[in-house]
Amino acid sequence: MMTGTIETTGNISAKKGGSVILQCHLSSTMAQVTQVNWEQHDHSLLAIRNAELGWHIYPAFKDRVAPGPGLGLTLQSLTMNDTGEYFCTYHTYPDGTYRGRIFLEVLESSVAEHSARFQIP
């Protein structure tokens, strides 16, 4: 039975050219996290963090994605095209997979605010 919940940074906004931290947190379960996949709105994978094998950043994102903090992901040099949904998939044993959603809005405006409150989707 899957008892856990994924908390995410929810809807966030950040400045074009700036950076943003995408963060998910799995709580309320004793399941062991074996892997976390970070996926973009078009289903392309940004990065994978395997508990035993470490991080893999996909080549297309190598220059703009930094692993961490923790199981999160830092997206750098933001462009307007980065606006959209991001998903974290937690592969766990024995529960199975949990999925969280973050919506990132990249703004031209210098008043863009990077809100980092956690939300339960």
């Epitope: 094998l53 893999h56 998939t89």
Partner: antibody, heavy 121, light 108 residues
Amino acid sequence: QVQLVQSGAEVKKPGASVKVSCKASGYTFTSYYMHWVRQAPGQGLEWMGVIGPSGASTSYAQKFQGRVTLTRDTSTSTVYMELSSLRSEDTAVYYCARDHSDYWSGIMEVWGQGTTVTVSS
Amino acid sequence: EIVLTQSPGTLSLSPGERATLSCRASQSVRSSYLAWYQQKPGQAPRLLIYGASSRATGIPDRFSGSGSGTDFTLTISRLEPEDFAVYYCQQYFSPPWTFGGGTKVEIK
């Protein structure tokens, strides 16, 4: 061309250990992960584990945790799979398989010819 | 872990016929993280398809893969004598990576 050549057949007694080798050629050995998969007589395929290019990182299927050890020797471009505390159910053909990508994608692109391990008293 | 169920267990067909093999996952395999392998008696498996529909190097175009989510299909458009073998699907979305039980394609 890419080739994986495995060591010869082994007959072992229950409780013993076996070490199977897999010698790689035709590619940059230090750029790819190597998987191990086994197949019991008349049965399907079962993933056992994977080892990283440098040998520093390994990941094992829960079922084999504590009983299987993967190592690699860069000087001879060889990967080893050692399985301990053998029982009759470990009688199988053991395959090494090189990953398709420069990380642990899980796509097993090139396979060794297989090594038959028979466990019998 | 993700369990893959292949059907049918055995497919009896004649050369020149079309073969359709099915693979169903116990949970969604996102981004089509599914591969197909062919294995002939006494030989190692051979990668045919990855990403659900991309053919591996050197694989003839009579082999095609399709599907997403939990339902995937391998199609052999016109069976050649060398295609009679066992076919396995494998997911590489969620560790541990798992294989289906296989479908044997035999000569009718």
